[in-house]
Interface confidence: medium
């Protein structure tokens, strides 16, 4: 808290500019307006103030504006954004992408904070939905961000936004993520034909049901292993010899060097030796010719 | 976090020169606004030059003239040349960042310039 003192003669402040980076924490608080500040908000990013300055102008804005600054204040807010508590954002009505923008921008080349955290929540939930702008904007300053959010969260995502979807965008998503993603996914790219969607839906496979990689299996897609790598197991299980085959291509000689890896090790102990043995890679494990393969979920269904 | 040590202050009669230098580490020093700062006994801390980023410069009204600050981002260097020194600019001088990305509550020793008349 500052203390209350005079503007020593001379030194108001008419207009916000570098003059006033000489100016004392007391001064600053004696000697600038508020309303001046709140309409000069633009002319503050460019002025080197210190971050115990920017304390000063804080305090300012916030008697101003107890109950919230306006977007008009925060669309300029620039450094002044890193002064900023969750608790003071949660107090904000921001719907302007722009604005969004703006504030992104002071933070870029930084790891998320509270502060952004609790503004992209309030700017997402303002607009009932993440539309395409906005994932387009906060994937492009934070690759992870649709990986921080809940399945819960993503299912508010129109497929729409799907588009606006990098694969490095979900590189940290986990499979209940996915499982969320791929349906959307896959409405969103239904109109593309078969490799230019295999290109689209790929980053979103680690959620795709067995029938879907059964469907891709017919179509030559030529799957990379690490795609491959990523798919469910619960998913890959029932996929047969032939249907890998045809799903990696030329790259199933990969399959060699996983094999003690899921979900490759956990297919391989799935499969007849004698059709792993048509692949000629040396993959060993499968059930041994003569067995009798029981499908236990099957018989529970039946019974 | 970047550390700051200011060299360069000495004993100098009235209205002669020095040059200060302030030595940073850091990776992202040359992305920093710049500040040299003095200290007169029994006073505050006060701002007398600062450098952007880019090298544009700003000073206080009491040096304007006399003082002239820059920088060298390839040596992580900022200066600080003073001439026309007089009494009432003896302190101990400082840099610092003035970032608004980093609170500058961690200071270097300073450099004593003590100008005698």
């Known amino acids: 808290e500052v203390e209350k003192t005079a503007c020593p003669s001379g030194k108001k402040a008419r207009e916000i500019d570098e003059s006033l980076i000489f100016y004392k924490k007391w001064e600053l608080e004696a000697c600038v307006d508020a309303a001046l500040l709140a309409t000069q908000m633009d002319r503050v990013n460019a002025i080197p103030f210190t971050y115990e300055q920017l304390d000063v102008l804080k305090h300012k804005l916030d008697e101003l504006y107890p109950q919230g600054y306006p977007e008009s204040v925060i669309q300029h807010l620039g450094y002044l954004f890193l002064k900023m508590s969750p608790e003071d954002i949660r107090k904000w009505n921001v719907t302007s992408l722009e604005t969004l923008k703006a504030l992104l921008e002071v933070n870029k080349g930084h790891e998320m904070s509270p502060q952004v955290a609790t503004l992209i929540d309030r700017f997402v939930k303002g607009r009932g939905q993440l539309d395409k702008d906005t994932l387009d904007t906060l994937t492009a300053f934070y690759p992870g961000y649709l990986c921080s959010l809940s399945p819960e969260e993503l299912s508010s995502v129109p497929p729409s936004s799907i588009w606006a979807v990098r694969p490095q965008d979900l590189d940290t998503c986990d499979p209940r993520q996915l499982d969320v993603l791929y349906p959307k996914a896959r409405l969103a790219f239904q109109n593309m034909n078969g490799s230019e969607y295999f290109v689209k839906i790929q980053s979103f496979l680690g959620g795709a049901p067995t029938e879907d990689l059964k469907a891709l299996s017919q179509q030559n897609v030529s799957m990379d292993l690490a795609t491959f790598m990523k798919l469910r197991t619960d998913a890959v299980l029932p996929l047969t010899v032939a249907e890998v085959q045809k799903l990696l291509g030329p790259h199933v000689e990969g399959l060699k060097a996983e094999e003690r890896h899921r979900p490759v090790r956990d297919w391989i102990l799935r499969q007849r030796q004698d059709d792993l043995d048509t692949l000629g890679l040396g993959l060993q494990g499968g059930i041994p010719n003569g067995y009798l393969v029981l499908d236990l979920s099957m018989q529970e269904a039946l019974s | 976090e970047v550390q700051l040590v200011e060299s360069g202050g000495g004993l100098v009669q009235a209205g002669g020169s020095l040059r200060l230098s302030c030595a940073a580490s850091g990776s992202t020093f040359s992305s920093y606004p710049m500040g040299w700062y003095r200290q007169a006994p029994g006073k505050q801390r006060e701002l007398v030059a600062a450098?952007?980023?880019?090298?544009?410069?700003n000073y206080a009204d009491s040096v304007k003239g006399r003082f002239t600050i820059s920088r060298d981002n390839a040596k992580n260097t900022v200066y600080l040349q003073m001439n026309s020194l007089k009494p009432e600019d003896t302190a101990v001088y400082y840099c610092?960042?003035?970032?608004?990305?980093?609170?500058?509550?961690?200071w270097g020793q300073g450099t004593q310039v003590t100008v005698s008349s």
């Open positions: 450098i952007s980023s880019g090298g544009s410069t």
């Open positions: 610092n960042t003035r970032s608004p990305r980093v609170p500058n509550d961690s």
